[in-house]
Amino acid sequence: DVERTTCPPEKEVHEIDESLIFYKKRELEACVDAALLAAQMDRVDAIPFTYEQLDVLKHKLDELYPQGYPESVIRHLGHLFLKMSPEDIRKWNVTSLETLKALLKVSKGHEMSAQVATLIDRVVVGRGQLDKDTVDTLTAFCPGCLCSLSPERLSSVPPSVIGAVRPQDLDTCGPRQLDVLYPKARLAFQNMSGSEYFVKIRPFLGGAPTEDVKALSQQNVSMDLATFMKLRREAVLPLTVAEVQKLLGPHVEGLKVEEQHSPVRDWILKQRQDDLDTLGLGLQGGIPNGYLILDLSVREALS
């Protein structure tokens, strides 16, 4: 922590300007009034402060606003945002997309994924839901940031907004997030024709249940292997060899390369070897011919 000293009269600060870059840390601490700093935050980013000096300024703001900064200050943080921790950001209430844009631009090129995720979370909370304008801002200024939101926050996305989401925005989404987004996407695209529907729904399919995947296999969609590999393991395991063949079309040839990877490996183990052989790829590990499969979990459930 910075030592408390009194400010020499000749160093007294009446406005935030470039002369402050020559102040030592303890001089900044003693001479800069926190309220003045807050009022003139829009000037800070234009001044080439060192990281050490920024630490002092942050300390000032923390003392002035122990419950979290007001949005008027947050909007003008500029490079001071790089000094914020997720704990700091969690105290904020942000509703303006201009604030979000400004801080996303500052964070670009810096390892700030935790801070950005927390910031986006605060924006969603502040605005009440993940509306179209917020989604548009995220896709434009922070591709992939949508997936930094928790499933709980994503549940506030109205289906009407799903159309604004691009495939690359979902690249880093996990299964739990896709579980939330998939039903919304299904609803959003329900009136589209077969091929158009598949193009739109494809990025969300990591959240699809088995019955929907089975339904797709009847529609000549020719699902690419990358999409198939992102399907939920639980959605893939009940599929028959015939269903996978119809689902993938010519892409089924790629199963050989993925033979040792989940969910293909797990799926292979549940198929009859005879059926796997019909794929013409030499896939191994299926249930040998003549073996009977007993599902003991069913018996346990009954006892």
Partner: antibody, heavy 121, light 107 residues
Framework: EVQLVQSGAEVKKPGASVKVSCKAS????????MHWVRQAPGQGLEWMGN????????YYNERFRSRVTMTVDKSTSTAYMELSSLRSEDTAVYYC??????????????WGQGTTVTVSS | DIQMTQSPSSLSASVGDRVTITCKAS??????IAWYQHKPGKAPKLLIH???ELQPGVPSRFSGSGSGRDYTFTISSLQPEDIATYYC?????????FGGGTKVEIK
Amino acid sequence: EVQLVQSGAEVKKPGASVKVSCKASGYTFTNYWMHWVRQAPGQGLEWMGNINPSNGGPYYNERFRSRVTMTVDKSTSTAYMELSSLRSEDTAVYYCARPYYGSSYGYFDYWGQGTTVTVSS
Amino acid sequence: DIQMTQSPSSLSASVGDRVTITCKASQDINKYIAWYQHKPGKAPKLLIHYTSELQPGVPSRFSGSGSGRDYTFTISSLQPEDIATYYCLQYANPLRTFGGGTKVEIK
């Protein structure tokens, strides 16, 4: 040693059909799909389609879909490619090729020697 | 379908010259590209797969590089036996496509 041996050269009249064979040996025939590629004089290589040798399911290049038929005879480890309604532009060398599934959908590491088909009236 | 645009369509170089051929895919092919040498009356010969992996027995003067949509094939020092047509093949999609070919001649 993996070998793909194709049938001999053919001369056909426009409108006729031609059936080229490709006999595989040195590997398990039903473990690799068979592909067909052609090269017309002065033109580049063109992928025509492929066939699953285990269930006989083919996938064709859209350009040939209406005229090509790919089949297999598992008992003799032979793949066939039949092209109908021949025209002079179908004059080409036709190759069968086997993929190696090292990455993605596989690249071709073994090729037949090629079958020259000449379409002339 | 993925289109492969290969250039130049032909080139003439002296023995010992460095020769470069490029292939541009219509979309990202994730390095799934192979290069073939094709001589008249013979079957195409695989030289390189997965952008830069040299096939066993292929001379080290042949090399490949690239990523995304742009790929390059290089012969570091052209030899008389390298006279042939060279093709790229994308196998990122099951419906394979070849480049148009580059005919390499000796000056």
